[in-house]
């Protein structure tokens, strides 16, 4: 695999980095004191991630644009690819250091190697993502991120096999968001809910991020989303491929979502 765009593509890292995940408060972003962040991670059977654990996760593509508490009162967030709105153009753990004021409010980075994780970082050429518990209904209060990281030059063909999320006009309760980028900040494609199968989506590059969020109320059947790696197209067949892509783009924009 080698090193490309700040990611060391080596599946050995998956084992070591498994178990790091990002948590927000019930009331939203940047609402947890250190004690609360610690309690949330411990209640779920883990503990606050150490700097090393967060860095190990980052090295296999864990990228979140939200500062969170780590072990020993440290605050930071993992950046795989630098961007103008996140990470000050740097890669690595953006480190705010050990905070003297433990009452400051941030998110949390938990570590639990035994957790039934939802989401993760995927470098396989094809994979199916399922909502937690599928085919049973998903749980309330879930946040899952699936980060797809393929070989440089490949693109991602995303298709929805099953889809049933709580329906509401703005998709504010339960939703899947798709981003044509490393994170859930850039390249917003759409927010989806309800029970209509969204159209296929084709990425513009070799990375994509899916975010699933469920609130504390109604649940539904959940989803299965499949992706397949598309190899780089040769010059001779590029015309055909471009037309497929633009049709795909038109279709997914007509899907059941609201722009943020």
């Amino acid at each position: 695999w080698g090193f490309k765009d700040g990611i060391f593509h080596n599946s050995i890292w998956l084992e070591r980095a498994a178990g790091v995940y990002h948590r927000e408060a019930r009331s939203g972003k940047y609402k947890l004191t250190y004690a609360e962040a610690k309690a949330v991670c411990e209640f779920e059977g883990g503990h606050l991630a150490t700097y090393k654990q967060l860095e190990a996760a980052r090295k296999i593509g864990f990228h979140v644009c939200a500062a969170g508490w780590m072990a020993k009162g440290r605050v930071g967030y993992p950046i795989v690819k630098p961007g103008p709105n996140c990470g000050f153009g740097k890669t690595g753990i953006i480190d705010y250091g050990i905070r003297l004021n433990r009452s400051e409010r941030w998110d949390a980075y938990c570590y639990n190697p035994h957790a039934k994780e939802c989401g993760g970082v995927f470098t396989d050429p094809k994979q199916i993502f399922k909502s937690p518990g599928f085919p049973n209904e998903y749980e309330d209060n879930q946040i899952c991120y699936w980060h797809i990281r393929l070989k440089y030059g490949q693109r991602i063909h995303l298709s929805f096999l099953d889809f049933d999320l709580e329906d509401d006009p703005g998709c504010l309760a339960d939703y899947v968001e798709i981003y044509d980028s490393y994170d859930d900040v850039h390249g917003f494609v759409g927010r989806y809910c309800g029970d209509e199968l969204p159209d296929d989506i084709i990425s513009t590059g070799n990375v994509m991020t899916l975010k699933f969020l469920s609130d504390a109320s109604v649940t539904a059947g959940g989803f299965q989303i499949k992706y397949v790696a598309m190899d780089p197209v040769s010059k001779s067949s590029q015309g055909k491929n471009t037309s497929t892509t633009s049709t795909g783009n038109k279709n997914f924009l007509a899907g059941r979502f609201s722009h943020l």
Epitope: A39, V40, K116, S217, T219
Partner: antibody, heavy 118, light 113 residues
Amino acid sequence: QVQLQQSGAELARPGASVKLSCKASDDTFINYGINWVKQRTGQGLEWIGETFPSNGNTFYNEKFKGKATLTADRSSSTTYMELRSLTSEDAAVYFCARHSNLPYFDHWGQGSTLTVSS
Amino acid sequence: DIVMTQSPSSLSVSAGEKVTMSCKSSQSLLNSGNQKNYLAWYQQKPGQPPKLLIYGASTRESGVPERFTGSGSGTDFTLTISSVQAEDLAVYYCQNDHSYPFTFGGGTNLEIK
């Protein structure tokens, strides 16, 4: 110190409306969900709804939709519950409670007693 | 909605005795993601708001005496008081915190003989 200070006892006529208040510390108001719970004399507890003042999200028990409206005033860090079209069934003690980031209510107001009588 | 059923509705015991009360939910309160049960127990004394005793079905809130123990998983839960004290006179409620609408059991009224 977390405190939820509720308004005093209210006496209202059937068919009228009443607005109960729950004043929180700024920290609690901004960072947590504020819930309302009903308890009729000698009865159990019924959850009415929850509001998140930081983002305006509000969730109701279907049973109380149309009966209760939850609002929040940022300037005073106060959450309100308005009850309309009052009947004798609405006579109860109403508690506001803060929901922790873990699955429980960790702080409660002292309760506001509503009497409905003509 | 998840229905919470408590039993018995009341019980009368002497100080020092062991007490067990039950709470059953109409749906599982186990979160499959983290394998935690989203059930809490509260104690309510006359004229006061409820006070948290146990959360996550079995985690004792800080400051709560060790004689209070919560157990159970899925749909069947138990609160045990190993040696009842006079100050334990109260109504005990279980609460579903798994999903909206949050629901409470009807309560178990503990009287001291």
